[in-house]
């Protein structure tokens, strides 16, 4: 039960995270005009990964796409690449994790296959989250560097009578969305990896444990039983006791070492 919950929660958290990464990547407000200690302008500038926008006081907003590829800073290209890789890995991870969910049964898929798929999706989510966090952090670092450079320019080279309004940019909403989304995807991935340990069938052959039912001595050896598909009766997967029948799923409902993660 705890394994299913951990897996399900990991999937949901990752889903929210990846949706956030996609939203952050598409948002225009990666950097916004710094209004502190600056002349109050009647226009507000903000920039995204794909276009820059200007909003006039009247509400009129004009956005222009970056229609050049070679003319863009290498750092911006790197951030774009990191965010896209994050989205692609996350999307594949989501696809894989849907089939890996314990609550969804597909054919006669073994627990070991579901465990492997859960681990795969978990790793993909972790890498996806790391890509997003790295992308946002690189952009934030670029902003900080440019901010202090433009601040230095504001106080130097003003020997002439004519002043130029230096537009400084600070962190936009997309950065915070990206950081949170990347973190959620990372957490979701870790949860999927933890759930994988609980899904993996027990390989160790424990010593026979004696169960006494109705005075009869029945030896029960835990082993690699195939998971019940749920389609029809599968007597191979049932251990018949004098006291009644219990499916493997019911046997697993007893506390195991994986339930305390």
């Amino acid at each position: 039960m705890a394994v299913t919950a951990c897996q399900g929660l990991g999937f949901v958290v990752s889903l929210i995270g990846i949706a956030g990464i996609i939203a952050a990547t598409c948002m225009d407000q990666w950097s916004t005009q710094d209004l502190y200690n600056n002349p109050v302008t009647a226009v507000f500038n903000y920039q995204g990964l794909w276009r820059s926008c200007v909003r006039e006081s009247s509400g009129f907003t004009e956005c222009r796409g970056y229609f050049t590829l070679l003319g863009l800073p290498a750092m911006l290209q790197a951030v774009r690449a990191l965010m896209i890789v994050g989205i692609v890995l996350g999307a594949i991870g989501l696809l894989v994790s849907i089939f890996a969910l314990k609550c969804i049964r597909i054919g006669s898929m073994e627990d070991s296959a579901k465990a492997n798929m859960t681990l795969t999706s978990g790793i993909m989510f972790i890498v996806s989250g790391l890509c997003a966090i790295a992308g946002v952090s690189v952009f934030a670092n670029m902003l900080v560097t440019n901010f202090w450079m433009s601040t230095a320019n504001m106080y130097t080279g003003m020997g002439g009578m004519v002043q130029t309004v230096q537009t400084r940019y600070t962190f936009g909403a997309a950065l915070f969305v990206g950081w949170v989304a990347g973190g959620l995807t990372l957490i979701g991935g870790v949860m999927m990896c933890i759930a994988c340990r609980g899904l993996a069938p027990e390989e160790t052959n424990y010593k026979a444990v004696s169960y006494h039912a109705s005075g009869h001595s029945v030896a029960y050896k835990p082993g690699g039983f195939k998971a019940s598909t749920g389609f029809g009766s599968n007597t191979k997967n049932k251990k018949i006791y004098d006291g009644g029948a219990r499916t493997e799923d019911e046997v697993q409902s007893y506390p195991s070492k994986h339930d305390y993660v």
Partner: antibody, heavy 118, light 113 residues
Framework: QVQLKQSGPGLVQPSQSLSITCTVS????????VHWVRQSPGKGLEWLGV???????DYNAAFISRLNIRKDNSKSQVFFKMNSLKPNDTAIYYC????????????WGQGTTLTVSS | DIVMTQSPSSLPVTAGEKVTMSCKSS????????????LTWYQQKPGQPPKLLIY???TRDSGVPDRFTGSGSGTDFTLTISSVQAEDLAVYYC?????????FGAGTKLELK
């Protein structure tokens, strides 16, 4: 067509306040802002302040302490009030619509001539 | 505050001639975000409120004759009337629409020679 009609007193005594109403037609105050500008022989055209479509205001720092602009969207009216008038506040006061482009003023009221004198 | 300096203060003209007037700002009115200059030109005739002619330094407002042309960037701007008509005799003002408080020039008066 777009129109801005102003109504207000012509003569005000020093230290009194000036109230002007700008009634607009042909557009909605929920879509456009309204600026206030004055013109005097001594100082030329001076921007005083603006009330935007959302109701937020921007004032000229030189007048912020004695200026208040508000509006009633349902009545299509903008209210301008300036306190503590002095003789050098004698001017023609205009309301003007904020153009959608370029932060400019595309339609102007006919003006309210104010004389501050005892 | 940004200071807008217009020259000349008075410009005597004859009908049909080409005239240019200048407007200089104490700070750049060029917005780096969209590469637009936030400078506006107005025309004011006696007893009337100002009328919008040109915004973004060079974009004519609707209904403005094409003999009016705005140019310039940063701090130096020019309004050109290619062939002055009698109805163009008025005072022309430039305005900073970029940094608050929005400020106007003292005007250039176009009058007959």
């Amino acid at each position: 067509q777009v129109q801005l009609k102003q109504s207000g007193p012509g003569l005000v005594q020093p230290s009194q306040s000036l109230s002007i109403t700008c009634t607009v037609s042909g557009f909605s105050l929920t879509r456009y802002g309204v600026h206030w500008v004055r013109q005097s022989p001594g100082k030329g055209l001076e921007w005083l302040g603006v009330i935007w479509s959302g109701g937020n205001t921007d004032y000229n720092a030189a007048f912020i302490s004695r200026l208040n602009i508000r509006k009633d969207n349902s009545k299509s009216q903008v209210f301008f009030k300036m306190n503590s008038l002095k003789p050098n506040d004698t001017a023609i006061y205009y309301c003007a619509r904020a153009a959608y482009f370029g932060n400019s003023f595309d339609y102007w009221g006919q003006g309210t001539t104010l004389t501050v004198s005892s | 505050d940004i200071v807008m300096t217009q020259s000349p203060s008075s410009l005597p003209v004859t009908a049909g001639e080409k005239v240019t007037m200048s407007c200089k700002s104490s700070q750049s009115l060029l917005n780096s975000g969209n590469q637009k200059n936030y400078l506006t030109w107005y025309q004011q005739k006696p007893g009337q409120p100002p009328k919008l002619l040109i915004y973004w330094a060079s974009t004519r407002d609707s209904g403005v004759p094409d003999r009016f042309t705005g140019s310039g960037s940063g701090t130096d701007f020019t309004l050109t009337i290619s062939s002055v008509q009698a109805e163009d005799l008025a005072v022309y003002y430039c305005q900073n629409n970029y940094i608050y408080p929005l400020t106007f020039g003292a005007g250039t008066k176009l009058e007959l020679k």
